[in-house]
Structure formats: structure tokens, C-alpha cells
């Protein structure tokens, strides 16, 4: 069964990736890219670290953990449906073909509650899925908006929500990890 990571539109997504530095402060360059890991480097780079610091990043992409201790997990801020896909975490260990590569799948779900949705495409016949409409609006306009108080029609989804949050926690604890040295 495939391992994937999930977040909702408007939330932050978390993609785990770790390594254990050979010695404190002895860091290894890491790159994050969109799309599967190529033979070398990362494609469509969104963030990069060197031996000392984060030396390249793009908006919405950041490292929330202590990357100096090898936690190079990626946080993507305020996700949209367009953020769905494969992300490459590449730990660039010195030497020929020594890199560790991890392809992580990120699935973005439409927000569970969509009050007065903004412009969306082909919504007329779309159907509810976990109190959402399946995402056929331009990803960049699928905003979360302000959430109304919970009502009875939402209670039936609580089991699904619990399942999803439990899965997210399980996956958070099972991220890509390697030891160096």
C-alpha cells in the first residue's frame, strides 16, 4: 500500500525527511524539488541547504525543524490543489552516486467546508465528498475562507476526519530517515 501525505487546501503541508549528521554541525547539502528525483540534483527546486545554512528557498516553502540536527522536513504554507504531486528530498552525500533520494507523495484535499466558494470551474454537477466539492476549481482560487460553526450535517464526517488525522500523525512519525557516518 502506498505511503502518502495529505493536507487540506489552506492548511500547511508537512513532508518528513531526516538524516543524522556524522558530527554536530557537520551538515550535508539537501535539496527539495517538485517532481520525482532525477538522477542528479532536484528538478524544479523549491528549497536548498548547503553545509551551513538554507541558501535558497521560494515563497511558501520552508524548513520548520532544526535542519542543523538533520531535520530537513519541508513545510509548504497555505497549500492549494496545485501543490498535489511528488516531491523529492535529496540528501547530497559527498562522493559519486552516494545521494539518498526520497520521493514523497502529497495529496491536497479540498477544504471540508467551503462557504460561498470563490470562482471555481465546472462546479454545477460536482458532488460532495467529505463535505467538499471535488476540486475542479482553479487551485489558486480554492480558498478556505472563514469556517461556520459545526452543524449536524458535518457530524457524519467526524470518523473520516479522525481517520485522516491519525494517518497524518502515523506518517509524520514514519518519515524518510537516514544515518550518515
Amino acid at each position: 500500500s502506498e505511503v502518502e501525505y495529505r493536507a487540506e487546501v489552506g492548511q500547511n503541508a508537512y513532508l518528513p525527511c531526516f538524516y543524522t549528521p556524522a558530527a554536530p554541525g557537520n551538515l550535508v547539502p539537501v535539496c527539495w524539488g517538485k517532481g520525482a528525483c532525477p538522477v542528479f540534483e532536484c528538478g524544479n527546486v523549491v528549497l536548498r541547504t548547503d553545509e551551513r545554512d538554507v541558501n535558497y528557498w521560494t515563497s511558501r516553502y520552508w524548513l520548520n525543524g532544526d535542519f542543523r540536527k538533520g531535520d530537513v522536513s519541508l513545510t509548504i504554507e497555505n497549500v492549494t490543489l496545485a501543490d498535489s504531486g511528488i516531491y523529492c528530498c535529496r540528501i547530497q552525500i559527498p562522493g559519486i552516486m552516494n545521494d539518498e533520494k526520497f520521493n514523497l507523495k502529497l495529496v491536497i484535499k479540498p477544504a471540508k467546508v467551503t462557504p460561498a466558494p470563490t470562482r471555481q470551474r465546472d462546479f454545477t454537477a460536482a458532488f460532495p465528498r467529505m463535505l467538499t466539492t471535488r476540486g475542479h476549481g482553479p487551485a489558486e482560487t480554492q480558498t478556505l475562507g472563514s469556517l461556520p460553526d459545526i452543524n449536524l450535517t458535518q457530524i457524519s464526517t467526524l470518523a473520516n476526519e479522525l481517520r485522516d488525522s491519525r494517518l497524518a500523525n502515523d506518517l509524520r512519525d514514519s518519515g524518510a530517515t537516514i544515518r550518515i557516518g
Partner: antibody, heavy 119, light 107 residues
């Protein structure tokens, strides 16, 4: 490993119906919608519709609505497509496909089922 | 529905050649375009999604680019196993629609 296994080839007479199955494995069946496509000989791929096994929500391509009926069986993780009132122009390879999740690109496909309509 | 116009419909190239296929959408689809490879008697195989992102297991020689209405798919160095028909597909709106295909052959 995600797998979609479709039923075998069918030869039908005009006016008949046919039901094609697509058995899914390697993932939680109710977490993803199942799409159906067809490809007539020498033609481009055409999207038929999708079904959400979680709630039986269905959406069809308006251009060919009424030709196909989509159903699913959660207990066997199987999706079905029934084609009715078959005509020679319905001769095609029919595919089931799973999207990545809420976005309509398709990493996983069944092997295809050839439906031939001939008198 | 969004119409995807693909060109050329067929091409012949030598092993090692750079091959380029274009796809034009009838309206702006941002970067919501995927590319597939289909070999005779087989199902399509996803190569690229969201215009430029390679799917898992896809060789680096396959790349995609573009946004808005104009998209390009490139095989940087054609290999014998790349002989197939290639399709673009917009995933911006329902119904998803495909291009007419480009048949790639070896000279």
C-alpha cells in the same frame, strides 16, 4: 503497489449492453474516485466519467451522457461501467484509471478492455 | 470543453535526436497539463504532470514546459524504447481532455 485489473474483451451485437469491471488493489478503494476513458481505433482518448466509491457520487461527460452507467462495490474494491444500446461507434478500448487524488491526472491505469460492436 | 491541439501528428527521428512535441489549449489552463506515453496495445503511462513535473520512475530525458495555452514536451535524446504515441491532457477542468497524439518513430 496500486493495480487496476479489468475484465476481458467483449464482442457484442448492436443494441446490446456490456458491463466492464475494474478491480482495484494496493490502496484504500474509497479514498479515490475511479475514472473511465475510452479510445476508439485511431482516435484520441476520451474521458467518460468518474465514480466516488466512498459515496457513489458520479459525474459523466455531458457529450456522451446516457451511454455509460458507473457503479462500484466497496466490498470487492471493484468499479463497473455498463454500456447500453451499443452501436458500432462504441467499438473502442475502455480504460479505468485512478487519479492522484482530487487532481485529474492519472498515474494508474487498467490494462484496457476491448469492446467490439459488430452485427 | 477545452480542446487540446497537438502537433505534429507524427514524426520520425534518429536515435539520440532531440524530439519536441507541442500542445495548444483552446483556453488558459495555467500549468495544468499532463503528458502520457502509449505503446501499441498498452494503457497510457503518465510521464509529466502540472506541465513540468516528472512522475516517479520517468527518465530524466523526458521534460515538459509551458503555461497558459502553449506547452512543450521534449525527449532530449531519443532512445529505441521511446517509440510510442504521446498525448497531452489538460487537468484544469472537467471533462479532462486529451490531444490527438503524436506518433514518434525511428528513422
Amino acid at each position: 503497489e496500486v493495480q487496476l485489473v479489468q475484465s476481458g474483451a467483449e464482442v457484442k451485437k448492436p443494441g446490446a449492453s456490456v458491463k466492464v469491471s475494474c478491480k482495484a488493489s494496493g490502496y484504500t478503494f474509497t479514498n479515490y474516485v475511479m475514472h473511465w476513458m475510452r479510445q476508439a481505433p485511431g482516435q484520441r482518448l476520451e474521458w467518460i466519467g468518474y465514480i466516488d466509491p466512498d459515496n457513489d457520487g458520479i459525474k459523466y461527460n455531458e457529450k456522451i451522457k446516457g451511454k455509460a452507467t458507473l457503479t462500484s462495490d466497496k466490498s470487492s474494491s471493484t468499479a463497473y461501467m455498463e454500456l447500453s444500446s451499443l452501436r458500432s461507434e462504441d467499438t473502442a478500448v475502455y480504460y479505468c484509471a485512478r487519479d492522484f487524488g482530487y487532481v485529474d491526472w492519472f498515474p494508474y491505469w487498467g490494462q484496457g478492455t476491448t469492446v467490439t460492436v459488430s452485427s | 470543453d477545452i480542446v487540446m491541439t497537438q502537433s505534429p501528428s507524427s514524426l520520425s527521428a534518429s536515435v539520440g535526436d532531440r524530439v519536441t512535441i507541442t500542445c495548444k489549449a483552446s483556453q488558459d489552463v495555467t500549468t495544468a497539463v499532463a503528458w502520457y506515453q502509449q505503446k501499441p496495445g498498452k494503457a497510457p503511462k503518465l510521464l509529466i504532470y502540472s506541465a513540468s513535473n516528472r512522475y516517479i520512475g520517468v527518465p530524466d530525458r523526458f521534460t515538459g514546459s509551458g503555461s497558459g495555452t502553449d506547452f512543450t514536451f521534449t525527449i532530449s535524446s531519443l532512445q529505441p524504447e521511446d517509440i510510442a504515441t504521446y498525448y497531452c491532457q489538460q487537468h484544469y477542468s472537467i471533462p479532462p481532455t486529451f490531444g490527438g497524439g503524436t506518433k514518434v518513430e525511428i528513422k
